[in-house]
């Protein structure tokens, strides 16, 4: 706490300007009116105040707005935002995308801090859903943002927002997240033609079921190996050799280099060796000729 002392004669601040830069802690406390500070917050960023001075300015705002800052002040916090705690931010009601952008700009180039995570959480909860403009903004600042959300949180993303998602935004998503995002992407892109559809849906395919992969195999899509390796193992296993060949097109040759890795390894174990040999890649480990394959999971389902 800063002691309450009278402001020395002639030092009362009439505006927030660079003359305050060498005010001591107690002088700032005594000579700067909190209401003046609130209306001229945008000027603070142009003045290199020290941490000690910024703490005094924050304290003045906290006293003026004990229930949380109004959005008019929040939008102009600038670098003072980095001095806020998640507890401070939980008191705010941020509704404007411009305010969100202004504060994310301050943290640009850095990892997502607890302050930023709290701010985003408050903003999204206030909006009720992760709309396209918000998602656009968040992924522009934090490409990995989408993959930091739980499957439950992702379920509130409307299909229309999927248009804002770039392939790199999904780089760190796990299968559970892609399971939620894929049906939304399928819905969002459903009116596109074959090749355009594949370009858009490609990065979401880690959540695709077998029947959708079978359908894609009929469309000459030429899926690359990197995408194939990210497919769900359970979705790849039922595909026939012919379907995989059609799905990968000229990239089918890449299977040889990946034969020891999932899902290729597990898929090979489920194929007849005869069928694998038709690829001419030297893939080994298929079911020997003359063996009968019983699908026990299907048998259990029937009984």
């Amino acid at each position: 706490e800063v002691e309450k002392t009278a402001c020395p004669s002639g030092k009362k601040a009439r505006e927030i300007d660079e003359s305050l830069i060498f005010y001591k802690k107690w002088e700032l406390e005594a000579c700067v009116d909190a209401a003046l500070l609130a209306t001229q917050m945008d000027r603070v960023n142009a003045i290199p105040f020290t941490y000690e001075q910024l703490d005094v300015l924050k304290h003045k705002l906290d006293e003026l707005y004990p229930q949380g800052y109004p959005e008019s002040v929040i939008q102009h916090l600038g670098y003072l935002f980095l001095k806020m705690s998640p507890e401070d931010i939980r008191k705010w009601n941020v509704t404007s995308l411009e305010t969100l952008k202004a504060l994310l700009e301050v943290n640009k180039g850095h990892e997502m801090s607890p302050q930023v995570a709290t701010l985003i959480d408050r903003f999204v909860k206030g909006r009720g859903q992760l709309d396209k403009d918000t998602l656009d903004t968040l992924t522009a600042f934090y490409p990995g943002y989408l993959c930091s959300l739980s499957p439950e949180e992702l379920s509130s993303v409307p299909p229309s927002s999927i248009w804002a998602v770039r392939p790199q935004d999904l780089d760190t998503c796990d299968p559970r997240q892609l399971d939620v995002l894929y049906p939304k992407a399928r819905l969002a892109f459903q009116n596109m033609n074959g090749s355009e559809y594949f370009v858009k849906i490609q990065s979401f395919l880690g959540g695709a079921p077998t029947e959708d992969l079978k359908a894609l195999s009929q469309q000459n899509v030429s899926m690359d190996l990197a995408t194939f390796m990210k497919l769900r193992t359970d979705a790849v296993l039922p595909l026939t050799v012919a379907e995989v060949q059609k799905l990968l097109g000229p990239h089918v040759e890449g299977l040889k280099a990946e034969e020891r890795h999932r899902p290729v390894r597990d898929w090979i174990l489920r194929q007849r060796q005869d069928d694998l040999d038709t690829l001419g890649l030297g893939l080994q480990g298929g079911i020997p000729n003359g063996y009968l394959v019983l699908d026990l999971s299907m048998q259990e389902a029937l009984s």
Partner: antibody, heavy 120, light 106 residues
């Protein structure tokens, strides 16, 4: 890219004067507070003087107060240090440095320095 | 605010882990920066806000600490790291520097 180039250093007798200049380029000079920092031979760094973006707020270290004058010309993207009544202990490399904008008050870009030698 | 660096100099070999400390005469929160200076060159900013790495600085450099005690660590010393290192506080004016730590080749 950001560049700061100092000039004006040299050999001067005790009691003499010297004017250092710093030419800035690669950034909006008028948006930044600027500093002079010096380093005596084999010694550490000393923050000597500081000037606000408009030039109206100035700081001097006690060791140079009343003898040195900092100024700037935003139209010419230049920073100056007028040094009067020089003493042997003012012998140092003088660096012009830009003060970063943002939460931290630090020196994000420095010039290569100019050597001032005060000796009879 | 006075900053005291230790040691004032140290000898180390390439690949060594090197630790330099900076102690403030009073609490300065995380308001501390570290600079590297090579002979005949201007100082270069390495770390700010005690632990944030300046853009373009190798990840072998790291900073830690808060209050009065701070540390600069070089996880695996490289030939280009032999230099003098300075800390600087920006908690309050006047801004001050530590006395420096010279890292020499053993």
């Amino acid at each position: 890219q950001v560049q700061l180039v100092e000039s004006g250093g040299g050999l001067v007798k005790p009691g003499g004067s010297l004017r250092l200049s710093c030419a800035a380029s690669g950034f909006t000079f008028s948006d930044y507070y600027m500093s002079w920092i010096r380093q005596a031979p084999g010694k550490g760094l000393e923050w000597v003087s500081y000037i606000s973006s408009s030039g109206s707020t100035i700081y001097y270290a006690d060791s140079v107060k009343g003898r040195f004058t900092i100024s700037r010309d935003n139209a010419k993207n230049s920073l100056y240090l007028q040094m009067n009544s020089l003493r042997a202990e003012d012998t140092a490399v003088y660096y012009c440095a830009r003060t970063s904008r943002g939460l931290c008050v630090l020196f994000d870009y420095w010039g290569q320095g100019t050597l001032v030698t005060v000796s009879s | 605010i006075q900053l005291t660096q230790s040691p004032s100099s140290l000898s180390a070999s390439v690949g060594d882990r090197v630790t330099i400390t900076c102690r403030a005469s009073q609490g300065i929160s995380s308001a501390l920066a570290w600079y590297q200076q090579k002979p005949g060159k201007a100082p270069k900013l390495l770390i700010y806000d005690a632990s944030s790495l300046e853009s373009g600085v190798p990840s072998r450099f790291s900073g830690s600490g808060s209050g009065t005690d701070f540390t600069l660590t070089i996880s695996s010393l490289q030939p280009e790291d032999f230099a003098t290192y300075y800390c600087q506080q920006f908690n309050s004016y006047p801004l001050t520097f530590g006395g420096g730590t010279k890292v020499e080749i053993k």
